[in-house]
């Protein structure tokens, strides 16, 4: 059965997946897909790496961890209810039927609505200014709430703050970290 992860509408979702490369930078291709892992590849691919870097992506999907050291956890920005479902993380180890497959279930909950303390709503508090920040691709924007502009060097730190570390630990405890080589 899939491990379950939760996020709120408008927040970033974090789906952990790890492996240990034989040597840092000696990567195994990885794909992430929407839907359970099929026999081969990933269905409905949202992100893929080759032996060096991300070579296929869709705009809200990021590898914010140090994927060259095996942290291929997926961050989905600004989730909607439509992002609910099963995601496949597939570590494409060379050789026949060697792939490691992990199915992760993402449950998106509606955003919590906090009632306004007075009749005259403070729109700045209720709807913080949404700023775009630069991500891992030229001019692709990612919405990370009311934050100052950040660049690539800050994305990783931000991702660490956003993720639920307990979930990452749960996944590690469930044995979803594999060693290559």
């Amino acid at each position: 059965s899939e491990v379950e992860y939760r996020a709120e509408v408008g927040q970033n979702a974090y789906l952990p997946c790890f492996y240990t490369p034989a040597a840092p930078g000696n990567l195994v291709p990885v794909c992430w897909g929407k839907g359970a892992c099929p026999v081969f590849e990933c269905g409905n691919v949202v992100l893929r790496t080759d032996e060096r870097d991300v070579n296929y992506w869709t705009s809200r999907y990021w590898l914010n961890g140090d994927f060259r050291k095996g942290d291929v956890s997926l961050t989905i920005e600004n989730v909607t209810l439509a992002d609910s479902g099963i995601y496949c993380c597939r570590i494409q180890i060379p050789g026949i039927m060697n792939d490691e497959k992990f199915n992760l279930k993402l449950v998106i909950k509606p955003a919590k609505v906090t009632p306004a303390p007075t009749r005259q709503r403070d729109f700045t508090a209720a709807f913080p200014r949404m700023l775009t920040t630069r991500g891992h691709g030229p001019a692709e924007t990612q919405t990370l709430g009311s934050l100052p502009d950040i660049n690539l060097t800050q994305i990783s730190t931000l991702a660490n703050e956003l993720r639920d570390s307990r979930l990452a630990n749960d996944l590690r405890d469930s044995g979803a970290t594999i060693r290559i080589g």
């Epitope: 070579n55 060259r68 891992h136 660049n151």
Partner: antibody
């Protein structure tokens, strides 16, 4: 193996448009990666001009934004550069290249020298 | 724009030497730096990406290091075929990736 090959006129008159083609073999430009134009001026300074993603979206160097367009023909596995209103300052060797999401370049074409002169 | 400065336009070396080509970014670019080698009449070739990862097929005498604003490409045991121009590139800031001004490696 992936190969990129630039083609187009080697001489363009000032105020005209420069049009170049990059033909990619060994990989479909719709299957992944980003597909870039980079130029190198006399004296060897390199300038990134813009890209078209495998998905078809584009982005350009702000210094060229009003003059540049990058398009593609997926049936021929080609992508194109058009630079309008050229001046002698646009004389350069033009390269097409394949990049990653993070925009470093693993494969480059051999380059084509374009001279802008009356 | 982030400016990548290669302060030495030319560097003289001898076969068998160890040489370090430096590149300084005008602001923090993390490890989002690549190095390219270009020989006369040829297109640039990728040597290093993500500051320290050697591209496939690149001899291990080429080493990249650094993070933040200071980066170094070290060539140990220089060979005659290494005489070329070397460029750094940052890809931390978008939409603009920028290149260094280049350092030409010559024989003493």
């Amino acid at each position: 193996d992936v190969q990129l090959q630039e083609s187009g006129p080697d001489l363009v008159k000032p105020s005209q448009s420069l049009s170049l083609t990059c033909t990619v073999t060994g990989y479909s430009i719709t299957s992944g990666y980003s597909w870039h134009w980079i130029r190198q001026f006399p004296g060897n300074k390199l300038e990134w001009m813009g890209y078209i993603y495998f998905s078809g979206s584009t982005n350009y160097n702000p210094s060229l934004k009003s003059r540049i367009s990058i398009t593609r023909d997926t049936s021929k596995n080609q992508f194109f550069l058009q630079l309008n209103s050229v001046t002698t300052e646009d004389t350069a060797t033009y390269y097409c290249a394949r990049g990653y999401r993070s925009a470093w370049f693993a494969y480059w074409g051999q380059g084509t020298l374009v001279t802008v002169s009356a | 724009d982030i400016v990548m400065t290669q302060s030495q336009k030319f560097m003289s070396t001898s076969v068998g030497d160890r040489v370090s080509v430096t590149c300084k970014a005008s602001q923090n670019v993390g490890t989002n730096v690549a190095w390219y080698q270009q020989k006369p009449g040829q297109s640039p070739k990728t040597l290093i990406y993500s500051a320290s990862y050697r591209y496939s097929g690149v001899p291990d005498r080429f080493t990249g290091s650094g993070s933040g604003t200071d980066f170094t490409l070290t060539i140990s045991n220089v060979q005659s075929e290494d005489l070329a121009e070397y460029f750094c590139q940052q890809y931390n800031s978008y939409p603009l990736v920028t290149f260094g001004t280049g350092t030409k490696l010559e024989l003493k």
